[in-house]
Interface confidence: low
């Protein structure tokens, strides 16, 4: 079966900078990554970035670095001030769209004993939703 | 080679909506975001906001937000992009352009255009 | 918003002439930049891509260069048909448009 894994780090630099790191454990062919906070995208979540292998990338305010790291993994930096920051407590989540597993999405947040900058390893988080 | 064709001109009364469509064809639709553009009589351009029709997902300039909706439909390649509480400021030509890119990377342009939708509002 | 800034908002020019069009970004915007032709009437076309990459069926003639927030659209011997209203535009966060640069026949 298919896993989303997802680890979230918070910058030691900058405190309202984080680094959200997503990747998916398959064999199928990637055709879209969208990565969201506050919850699943469309379950109230809002989104950051969207990837497509071909297409390119789009992301939007805070996120100000969206990159693909491999063909099945990805990662965001996100840089917030205000009312546009992200919190220690604050979800995000990755969705993969690969062919032909279909959607898989899992979430994930800061470690709550977390110290700025560091992180464990990434470990596959529980797939919340396979459409 | 893709085309875009928009909707005919409009004429609207202040406070109304318009919704103006624009058609792809000759490629593929739902892998390339839709954009929307104005162009008030002798001004520039301004972005308004876009969508990728697969997996619909839309974003808007913050000055458009909340009187803006660009939708897609994937079924018959077409984008739509409604606005609403019209004023006489909103007396423009609107086009659609879609949003191609290199891969891997977050280079974007607007590449074709449509032919571009006249909007009048008075009233 | 990142904001762009165009200069000159006009200019006058012959035939021949050498051509330089400057844009700004208020903030680095890398590459992330496109220029585009308007003549009256019609839709916007796009010439370069990327700061610096030709658009395909585009004359050599245009070319772009910058990066971070300075760049420039040079047209290296105008052409009749050049003259026309440039526009440049930044795709790294969202989108923004320059004001324009209309390039007439002096």
């Known amino acids: 079966t298919p896993e989303v894994w997802v680890q979230v780090r918070m910058e030691a630099t900058e405190l309202s900078s984080f680094t959200i790191r997503c990747g998916f454990l398959g064999s199928g062919s990637i055709s879209l990554v969208t990565v969201s906070w506050g919850g699943p995208n469309g379950a109230g979540g809002t989104t950051l970035a969207v990837l497509h292998p071909e297409r390119g990338i789009r992301q939007w305010a805070p996120a100000r670095q969206a990159r693909w790291e491999t063909q099945s993994s990805i990662s965001l930096i996100l840089e917030g001030s205000g009312a546009s920051s992200p919190c220690a407590n604050t979800t995000f989540c990755c969705k993969f769209a690969s062919f032909p597993e279909g959607s898989w999405e899992a979430c994930g947040s800061l470690p709550p004993s977390s110290d700025p900058g560091l992180s464990a390893p990434p470990t596959p988080a529980p797939i919340l939703r396979a459409d | 080679q893709v085309q875009l064709v928009q909707s005919g001109a409009e004429v609207k009364k202040p406070g109304s909506s318009v919704k103006v469509s624009c058609k792809a064809s000759?490629?593929?639709?739902?892998?390339?975001?839709i954009s929307w553009v104005r162009q008030a009589p002798g001004q520039g351009l301004e972005w308004m906001g876009g969508?990728?029709?697969?997996?619909?997902?839309?974003n808007y300039a913050q000055k458009f937000q909340g009187r803006v909706t660009i939708t897609a439909d994937e079924s018959t390649s077409t984008a739509y992009m409604e606005l609403s509480s019209l004023r006489s400021e909103d007396t423009a030509v609107y086009y659609c352009?879609?949003?191609?890119?290199?891969?891997?990377?977050?280079?974007?342009?607007?590449?074709?255009w449509g032919q571009g939708t006249l909007v009048t509002v008075s009233s | 918003d990142i904001q762009m800034t165009q200069s000159p908002s006009s200019l006058s020019a012959s035939v021949g002439d050498r051509v330089t069009i400057t844009c700004r970004a208020s903030?680095?915007?890398?590459?992330?930049l496109n220029w585009y032709q308007q003549k009256p009437g019609k839709a916007p076309k796009l010439l370069i891509y990327?700061?610096?990459s030709l658009q395909s069926g585009v004359p050599s003639r245009f070319s772009g260069s910058g990066s971070g927030t300075d760049f420039t659209l040079t047209i290296s011997s105008l052409q009749p048909e050049d003259f026309a209203t440039y526009y440049c535009?930044?795709?790294?966060?969202?989108?923004?448009f320059g004001g324009g640069t209309k390039v007439e026949i002096k």
């Open positions: 990327a700061a610096s």
């Open positions: 903030q680095s915007i890398s590459s992330y």
């Open positions: 000759g490629g593929t639709f739902g892998n390339y975001a």
């Open positions: 535009q930044q795709s790294d966060i969202l989108y923004t």
């Open positions: 352009a879609r949003d191609t890119g290199r891969g891997y990377t977050r280079h974007f342009w607007f590449d074709p």
């Open positions: 969508i990728i029709p697969i997996p619909g997902i839309a």
